[in-house]
């Protein structure tokens, strides 16, 4: 019989129940569970009564969810806790609005933040719920500041891997990259090594994805097939006779692309993608050591 049925029988047929079976002593309310609660909690907890715990949304119960009211009127509770399975938004600074607004976010979900009227955002605008259930980049880095007078307010200067959207800089989509220098990179999460480009690595970093440069022999880069004139890379130019792309001289670089750190003949130096591509195109062995300018030169 269920507890409710027994109670009902007790009322209808009290002679069937010896007095010793009528509970006169009860356990107190079951102990609280951090980030969780007792399902269908009643008000009376006689000896032998079981209760089942469950976790709040965004949390998963680890351990035995059942607790029992013991003979000594104490709860017999096994080892259990609620483990976070999602990112939750921290308390955001005044004026910051998040989109989409949800109680929790699963790994891989993205949140964008913006400022309410009259304020402008300082710091990153997009955050990713990482596999460690932490936001990347950290949300505390975003804050709202008073906008300058609209007459003097300049259009924000976006980085090359960003674009202007709703008067603020947001990460580009990878397909918006255009021609860029091929590199090999390791996905920090899966540890797989993949062919990328300098621009796509910047975009992935911008969107909170972690990739690290690896040697160019560690993956299969796209073959530098002879391209028709309409699709020359930054470091290529059109040869009128053959209607094919040929290598530029580094000194001929026009639209330069990103500034990157390259090791040439054992020495690190900052150069443009175009210059690096021109050297590689002409058969020189170069190694991209950073998708940003070399550290020593930026200090």
């Amino acid at each position: 019989c269920e507890d409710e049925e027994l109670e009902h029988l007790r009322l209808l047929e009290p002679h069937c129940f010896p007095l010793s079976l009528v509970p006169t002593e009860f356990c107190p309310s079951p102990p609280a569970l951090k980030d969780g609660f007792v399902q269908d909690e009643g008000t009376m907890f006689p000896v032998g009564k079981n209760v089942v715990y469950t976790c709040n949304e965004g949390y998963s119960l680890i351990g035995n969810p059942v607790a029992r009211c013991g003979e000594d009127l104490r709860w017999l509770v096994g080892e259990m806790h609620c483990q976070k399975i999602a990112c939750v938004l921290p308390v955001l600074m005044d004026g910051i609005q998040s989109h989409p607004q949800k109680p929790f976010y699963t790994v891989g979900e993205k949140v964008t933040v913006s400022c309410s009227g009259g304020m402008s955002l300082e710091g990153p605008s997009a955050f990713l719920c990482g596999s460690s259930l932490k936001w990347s980049p950290e949300m505390k880095n975003a804050r709202c500041v008073q906008k300058e007078n609209p007459l003097t307010q300049a259009v924000p200067k976006c980085q090359r891997w960003e674009k202007l959207q709703n008067s603020r800089c947001v990460c580009k989509m990878p397909y918006e990259c255009g021609p860029s220098l091929d590199v090999c990179a390791q996905d920090e999460r899966s540890k797989r090594i993949l062919p990328l480009t300098v621009c796509k690595m910047h975009v992935l970093h911008c969107q909170g994805r972690n990739y690290t440069l690896t040697g160019r022999d560690s993956c299969t880069l796209p073959a530098s097939a002879e391209k028709a004139c309409g699709a020359c890379p930054l470091w290529g130019k059109c040869d009128a006779e053959s209607s094919k792309c040929v290598c530029r001289e580094a000194s001929e670089c026009e639209e330069e692309g990103f500034s990157i750190c390259v090791e040439v003949n054992g020495k690190e130096q900052t150069m443009s993608e175009c210059e690096a591509g021109a050297l590689r195109c002409r058969g020189q062995s170069i190694s991209v050591t950073s998708i940003r300018p070399c550290a020593a030169e930026t200090q």
Partner: antibody, heavy 115, light 107 residues
Framework: EVQLQQSGPELVKPGASVKMSCKAS????????MHWVKQSHGKSLEWIGY????????SYNQNFKGKATLTVNKSSSTAYMELRSLTSEDSAVYYC????????WGQGTTLTVSS | DIQMTQSPASLSASVGETVTITCRAS??????LAWYQQKQGKSPQLLVY???TLADGVPSRFSGSGSGTQYSLKINSLQPEDFGSYYC?????????FGAGTKLELK
């Protein structure tokens, strides 16, 4: 609310050109790329290219280079696609769609190429 | 160019059932994948982007998953309004390409 209003159906002869329009409203026109997509009758979707309304820079699918030309008029928040040297293969519904993935789609312009 | 291979081409199911549509990319697209729904005579509508994020207003019975080159769209407890065609599309590099589509029909 984002809305993309496309021009009406077109019936044209082989060899001719056609220019269809897509008027955007409900958002800042320069904020989002405008993509164009072809859907032949009963078939899947084929990406033609996109244009960045900020700088007017287009990016084309190689299969449509020489066939399609994408332009924008920022003052009227309108994107245009011109298709030239038309053949019966070009008969299809053409969609404009704005956003990153893209997110929002117009109702489509039906192009029929027939003699 | 990255090719998208979508399966099945067609699918019959009843209201209340759960269905899964899959999409395979010919190269790693790093989760830059979208799913669209298209009803007869209408424009496609964005359902999912970044492989698993639901677009605004999309019911929670839809869910996207996958990584690398393999992705899927799952629809739990099919509703009458869910029948139509579904397309996957990557936005990792140009040209953006779509899968051939899956026609979901009422059994």
């Amino acid at each position: 609310e984002v809305q993309l209003q496309q021009s009406g159906p077109e019936l044209v002869k082989p060899g001719a050109s056609v220019k269809m329009s897509c008027k955007a409203s409900g958002y800042t026109f320069t904020d989002y790329n405008m993509h164009w997509v072809k859907q032949s009758h009963g078939k899947s979707l084929e990406w033609i290219g996109y244009i960045n309304p900020n700088n007017g820079g287009p990016s084309y699918n190689q299969n449509f280079k020489g066939k399609a030309t994408l332009t924008v008029n920022k003052s009227s928040s309108t994107a245009y696609m011109e298709l030239r040297s038309l053949t019966s293969e070009d008969s299809a519904v053409y969609y404009c769609a704005c956003g990153n993935y893209p997110d929002y789609w117009g109702q489509g312009t039906t192009l029929t190429v027939s003699s | 160019d990255i090719q998208m291979t979508q399966s099945p081409a067609s699918l019959s199911a009843s209201v209340g059932e759960t269905v899964t549509i899959t999409c395979r990319a010919s190269g790693n697209i790093h989760n830059y994948l979208a799913w669209y729904q298209q009803k007869q005579g209408k424009s496609p509508q964005l359902l999912v982007y970044n492989a698993k994020t639901l677009a605004d207003g999309v019911p929670s019975r839809f869910s996207g998953s996958g990584s690398g080159t393999q992705y899927s769209l799952k629809i739990n407890s099919l509703q009458p309004e869910d029948f139509g065609s579904y397309y996957c599309q990557h936005f990792w590099s140009t040209p953006l390409t779509f899968g051939a589509g899956t026609k979901l029909e009422l059994k």
